[in-house]
Interface confidence: medium
């Protein structure tokens, strides 16, 4: 932003009537009127080009220094050439100097030179030869020049005068300031530039209306420069929530839009599902029967939970069900859908039903299914099983309806085999199973299954035709899990339950029954 | 010495026409600006015309302009005055005045000049 | 275009006298005035310009003062050579003006 200038002293400006001290009095400068573009304008010039030495001061008036640190001196004079004289006028110069006094007071008519400092030498960049002087072609120069910084109250500008022709046309005192600001949300106060070329002034802005401070950013800050220009912007704010940027400020939210946090994008219209939001709404509310779960942003539709799944087959193979189904028609408006698998048993006998969980396996975790099959294992024969799956979503704990679909099965395999240890030696276990007489004609062969406890890496396999088996090579004094499992011509019978052996600890050697 | 010599004036019909020189000497002719002042008989000074040192700008009185053109030729070091349509009261005599800023101590220039040297006058009158 | 007067149009004097002639502008043309000395069938003569400066060869005993509307022409010591008429003439504007004389006569 471009600096902004307070004038301390405009001579152009004032028409003539500020009445500066010439010195010596009635010598030297004069002011003088002239007529340039049709407009009176004044100056103060002198040009005693022949006499020799000359020491013609000119004061302003006693300048208030105020809130200024450094000011800038702008003056636009005309020198004349000293060839455009005849003989050249060998006293005469070119230049002239510019002074200043720092006071607590006005000193009013008594100038005193001791007091003033000089500034600087100032010379003209083009000079006015005879030619221009006669047409009239006035050869503006423009110097600037800057002091600071200043302590006292007060100062007076002084221009001596050593035996040039030379006119002031304007003499402009003024400080800078950056201006009022607003930047990236922030309104920035005016500031007075400091007076130390390279130091810049740190200013903290303040967020407008409606905006913060993003969380973890960094405050609003700039550099006021010495110049009066903002440089380097640290931090910014954004439109809270429910409020969004039009040019410097933070407006709320039209209804039917929302803004859930504070952030550099606009208001959203409310998505589909919502009903319609007031003015500077945060968030947009669910239609009835419409939720949105604690994870869901703000911007997407609010969701249902999903209808049931819309097919479902339970296909038995022998202690083995395969359940398939097809994905809800209605998925709520949702992508997150999961299923759960229960399962329920009956003894046709008695007609009792129970929860059948821990007694079944299945191929993968029932609950939080993504896929739309899975395979239960180790059914029991002359069973009824009633399977429920449900579909379910991200909204469907905010409801207390299900959404499930049921198939049942009834089992005709083997009973599980009832497993004995007959025997165990520090390398082997000798093992023997039983199945009801009725049901052995169905029975192909059986499956030994053993692991060591504790190891869910690998597992050992024997199948054999009788009731027996001997499991050689093992290891001393270890536990393994062993289970046993009819195989028939349908599949796979249920299996017996796992049991625990464990080898002799080679100290205790013999070969006992168990 | 500067010296300045109007000529061409005499006697002419009211809607007639005259041409006045000025003949310059004695400084350099190009850096002056140039004027025509007259006085009619028994009368104050009146400002007629002028012409910048390089013929321009030009500048008249409103009683003469569109009538009379001033015109200069630095190379013969002459001034002119061509006066067409002619009236009865433009009898006077008339100066060849000029101006030299180089004495004129002021940093900025007059608006206008003022007449550091005249010539005698030459004599104009229209009468029928 | 601007207005010049002087008074008074005559005025008789003495060899020796104080003599004060007045110029008045019909509006401010700052210091921008020059002072013309004529003798009867001779060409006038610089004798003052930008109101206080005296023009080269022009005895010290002529002077000018004054600035924005009026201004003054003074001989301080009347000589025989000074019987003549004196004219201003401002140079604030293009259509340069002259007062319209003050005759000097001898008493």
């Known amino acids: 932003a471009q600096g902004k200038e307070v004038v301390l002293l405009d001579f152009a400006a004032a028409g003539g009537e500020l009445g500066w001290l010439t010195h010596p009095y009635g010598k030297g400068w004069d002011l003088m009127q002239n007529i340039m573009n049709d407009m009176p304008i004044y100056m103060y010039s002198v040009c005693n080009v022949m006499s020799g030495d000359q020491d013609n001061w000119l004061r302003t008036n006693w300048v208030y220094r105020g809130e200024a640190e450094r000011i800038f001196i702008e003056l636009k004079f005309t020198v004349r050439d000293c060839n455009s004289f005849p003989g050249g006028a060998s006293s005469c110069k070119e230049t002239f100097n510019l002074y200043y006094a720092e006071s607590d007071l006005d000193y009013g008519t008594n100038f005193q030179k001791r007091l003033f400092t000089k500034i600087d030498t100032i010379a003209p960049d083009e000079i006015t030869v005879s030619s221009d002087f006669e047409a009239r072609h006035v050869k503006l120069n423009v110097e600037e020049r800057s002091v600071g910084p200043l302590t006292r109250k007060g100062f007076y500008l002084a221009f001596q005068d050593i035996g040039a022709c030379v006119a002031l046309l304007s003499v402009r005192v003024y400080y800078k300031k950056c201006p009022e600001l607003l930047q990236g949300l922030a309104h920035f106060p005016e500031t007075i530039a400091g007076s130390d070329a390279p130091s810049l002034a740190t200013v903290a802005g303040t967020c407008v209306d409606h905006a913060v401070v993003p969380p973890g950013g960094e405050e609003p800050r700039m550099h006021c420069a010495v110049d009066g220009e903002w440089l380097v912007p640290i931090g910014q704010c954004l439109c809270q929530a429910g409020y969004e940027k039009v040019e410097d400020a933070c407006q709320a939210c039209s209804p039917g839009f929302f803004k859930f946090e504070a952030s550099e994008s606009p208001c959203l219209e409310c998505p589909e599902h919502t009903l319609p939001s007031p003015e500077g709404a945060t968030s947009c509310e669910c239609e009835e029967g419409f939720f949105r779960a604690p994870q869901d942003p703000a911007s997407m539709p609010c969701t249902r939970p999903p209808s049931a799944p819309h097919y479902l087959t339970a296909v038995g193979m022998g202690a083995k069900v395969e359940l398939r189904w097809t994905p809800p028609q209605d998925s709520g408006g949702r992508e997150d859908i999961v299923y759960s698998v229960t399962c329920e048993q009956c003894w046709p006998e008695s007609g009792e039903c129970g929860p059948c969980e821990a007694s079944v396996r299945y191929s993968e975790p029932p609950h939080g299914l993504t896929r739309t099959s899975v395979t239960v294992s180790d059914l029991e024969p002359h069973m009824n099983y009633t399977f429920t799956v449900e579909a379910r979503n991200g909204v469907s704990g905010l409801v207390t309806s299900r959404s499930f679909r049921t198939a049942s099965v009834s089992i005709n395999q083997t009973e599980p085999p009832k497993v004995r240890l007959e025997g165990r030696s520090t390398t082997s276990l000798s093992v023997s199973w039983s199945i009801p007489p009725p049901q052995q004609s169905r029975v192909w062969k059986y499956e030994v299954t053993y692991r060591k406890k504790g190891d869910s890496n690998s597992y050992n396999v024997r199948r054999t035709e009788g009731f027996s088996v001997t499991l050689d090579d093992l290891a001393p004094d270890t536990t393994y899990l062993v289970q046993v499992q009819a195989l028939t011509q349908e599949g796979q019978g249920a299996g017996s339950k796992v049991h625990e052996f464990q080898t002799l600890s080679p100290e205790g050697s013999g070969n006992l029954a168990v | 010495e500067v010296q300045l010599l109007e000529s061409g004036g005499g006697l002419v019909q009211p809607g007639g026409s005259l041409r006045l020189s000025c003949a310059a000497s004695g400084f350099t002719f190009s850096h002056y600006m140039m004027a025509w002042v007259r006085q009619a008989p028994g009368k104050g000074l009146e400002w007629v015309s002028r012409?910048?040192?390089?013929?321009?700008?030009?500048h008249y009185a409103d009683s003469v302009k569109g009538r009379f053109t001033i015109s200069r030729d630095n190379s013969k070091n002459t001034l002119y005055l061509q006066m067409n349509s002619l009236r009865a009261e433009d009898t006077a005599v008339y100066y060849c005045a000029g101006y030299d800023s180089g004495y004129d101590y002021v940093a900025v220039a007059g608006p206008a000049e003022y007449f550091q040297h005249w010539g005698q006058g030459t004599l104009v009158t229209v009468s029928s | 275009d601007i207005q010049m007067t002087q008074s008074p149009s005559s005025l008789s004097a003495s060899v020796g006298d104080r003599v004060t002639i007045t110029c008045r502008a019909s509006?401010?043309?700052?210091?921008?005035l020059a002072w013309y000395q004529q003798k009867p069938g001779k060409a006038p003569k610089l004798l003052i310009y930008?109101?206080?400066n005296l023009h080269t060869g022009v005895p010290s005993r002529f002077s000018g003062s004054g600035s924005g509307t009026e201004f003054s022409l003074t001989i301080s010591g009347l000589q025989p050579d000074d019987f003549a008429t004196y004219y201003c003439?401002?140079?604030?504007?293009?259509?340069?003006?002259f007062g319209q004389g003050t005759k000097v006569e001898i008493k």
């Open positions: 012409i910048g040192p390089s013929g321009g700008p030009t």
């Open positions: 509006q401010s043309i700052s210091t921008w």
């Open positions: 003439q401002q140079y604030n504007a293009y259509s340069r003006t």
């Open positions: 930008k109101a206080s």
